[in-house]
Interface confidence: medium
């Protein structure tokens, strides 16, 4: 026989609740954790349940994305009695279990942090010995990845009438602010931000007529940070080509 | 691409015995706890077993419980149903599903395959 | 076991209506509640999961609501593709049990 409860209100502090007589599921997320890429970061879950005393088999999890359905980053196993949750899946070998789900923590920690990995975790606890139960996160913890910006592209390219454009693209959380300047524009140019779709972290800004030869410069900054590119442009044989 | 694929399905007479397959592709089969769910000619939706990702719990219904067993092997990728003693009552498609949930409960079947007809006659 | 109910049994309806379904489950299940489509010579197909969650790839004309006994799924806007048979099934216990079906017809 199988029982189950899943979440059904929750408050400010994402305490995550169902309650019904002589019964008690809840889970603890916080709202949000902040840490750096390049650095670990722990997603906190603890959780109370109504079955006292519960010693047999259980599964941890984490999923990331949406609960439920989202694809899972980390599992565990512990078997009858054990407080070991030896670990059946870690995505990329970065996620490991911190809390003890015996004493039930789920807490995470996720190491060598990437932008990719800013997104919505679930934290989840199954029970399947005498007691059949599994309880879910719905709301979870957003796992905020901040980052210096980086300029991931920068190049050079033709563009009608034999003329040229440059275009500079940037990561960085908060998305960063690009800037050109060069020959003729002066000490900088603002260029208007522009976030590539499905790719939040990303920024990207077009010189769109590059009017005389030499150096062109990138600048991204956001609050962690700043950096920088440049390419060269060398018309050649009456703008036929470029040297970038 | 995600999908499951049964077989084994065929005419059986009364007494008989038949082994479904059901062979996952595209996700690891072993993440998640599978189910074989079937539905008689004209009629509705009936679970029938479950097994978790790891192989170590199994689930049936009160209508084939001591004549069918789940089975899964994780390097394989592929679920099993073997059927014995079936009855006419057992004549159906077959269908494997895969739990939107995790390893051991089922949530939801958000993969189901193309299904296998099992046709139990004398 | 946990018997699942629904109503109606049938239903005629013609492309642009709004339908609805309604499952009734013998206990209270929480939101442990799925619901299907599944056309002749085909495989069920999830719409929605734990009550009203959309699975991914299914419109949005769909959607769930419901808690404990009762349960509905909402066709807004019939499209011709619709029409169908449609299944609820609980995940609250073992064993999981389906709806008896909803068929889903061209008035």
């Known amino acids: 026989f199988v029982r189950t409860k899943i979440d059904t209100t929750e408050n400010l502090l994402n305490t995550e609740v169902h309650s019904s007589p002589a019964q008690r599921w809840s889970m603890q997320v916080p709202p949000e954790v902040s840490a750096e890429a390049g650095d670990a970061a722990v997603l906190p879950c603890t959780f109370t349940h109504p079955h006292r005393h519960y010693d047999g088999p259980l599964t941890a999890i984490w999923r990331a994305g949406e609960p439920y359905a989202g694809p899972q980053v980390f599992r565990c196993a512990a078997a009858r009695g054990s407080e070991l949750c030896q670990t059946a899946l870690s995505l990329h070998g970065r996620f490991r279990l911190l809390g003890n789900p015996r004493r039930n923590d789920l807490s995470l920690r996720v190491e060598r942090l990437a932008l990719a990995d800013d997104r919505r975790y679930f934290c989840r606890v199954e029970f399947a010995g005498d007691v059949h139960d599994r309880y879910e996160s719905r709301h979870g913890v957003r796992l905020h990845v901040t980052a210096a910006p980086r300029i991931v592209n920068i190049s050079v390219l033709p563009s009608p009438a034999h003329a040229f454009r440059a275009l500079c693209t940037a990561e960085g959380e908060p998305p960063p602010a690009l800037a050109w300047s060069g020959p003729a524009l002066g000490n900088s140019l603002a260029a208007v931000r522009s976030p590539r779709e499905g790719h939040g972290h990303l920024v990207t800004a077009e010189l769109p007529a590059l009017t005389h030869d030499g150096r062109y410069t990138c600048t991204a900054a956001n609050s962690l940070g700043r950096s920088e590119a440049s390419v060269y442009l060398f018309r050649f044989h009456g703008a036929s080509g470029a040297s970038t | 691409e995600v999908q499951l694929l049964e077989s084994g399905g065929g005419l059986v007479q009364p007494g008989g015995s038949l082994r479904l397959s059901c062979a996952a592709s595209g996700f690891t089969s072993s993440s998640y706890a599978m189910s074989w769910v079937r539905q008689a000619p004209g009629k509705g939706l009936e679970w029938v077993s479950t097994?978790?990702?790891?192989?170590?719990?199994?689930y049936y219904a009160d209508s084939v419980k001591g004549r069918f067993t789940i089975s899964r092997d994780n390097s394989k990728n592929t679920l099993y149903l073997q059927m014995n003693s079936l009855r006419a009552e057992d004549t159906a498609v077959y269908y494997c599903?895969?739990?939107?949930?995790?390893?051991?409960?089922?949530?939801?079947?958000?993969?189901w395959g193309q299904g296998t007809m099992v046709t139990v006659s004398s | 076991d946990i018997q699942m109910t629904q109503s109606p049994s049938s239903v005629s309806a013609s492309v642009g209506d709004r339908v609805t379904i309604t499952c009734r489950a013998s206990q209270d299940i929480s939101s442990w509640l799925a619901w299907y489509q599944q056309k002749p010579g085909k495989a069920p197909k999830l719409l929605i999961y734990?009550?009203?969650s959309l699975q991914s790839g299914v419109p949005s004309r769909f959607s769930g609501s419901g808690s404990g006994t009762d349960f509905t799924l909402t066709i807004s806007s019939l499209q011709p593709e619709d029409f169908a048979t449609y299944y609820c099934?609980?995940?609250?216990?073992?064993?999981?049990?389906f709806g008896q079906g909803t068929k889903l017809e061209i008035k």
């Open positions: 599903a895969k739990a939107i949930g995790s390893s051991w409960y089922s949530d939801a079947f958000d993969l």
């Open positions: 734990v009550a009203s």
């Open positions: 097994i978790s990702g790891g192989g170590g719990s199994t």
């Open positions: 099934q609980q995940s609250y216990s073992i064993p999981y049990t």
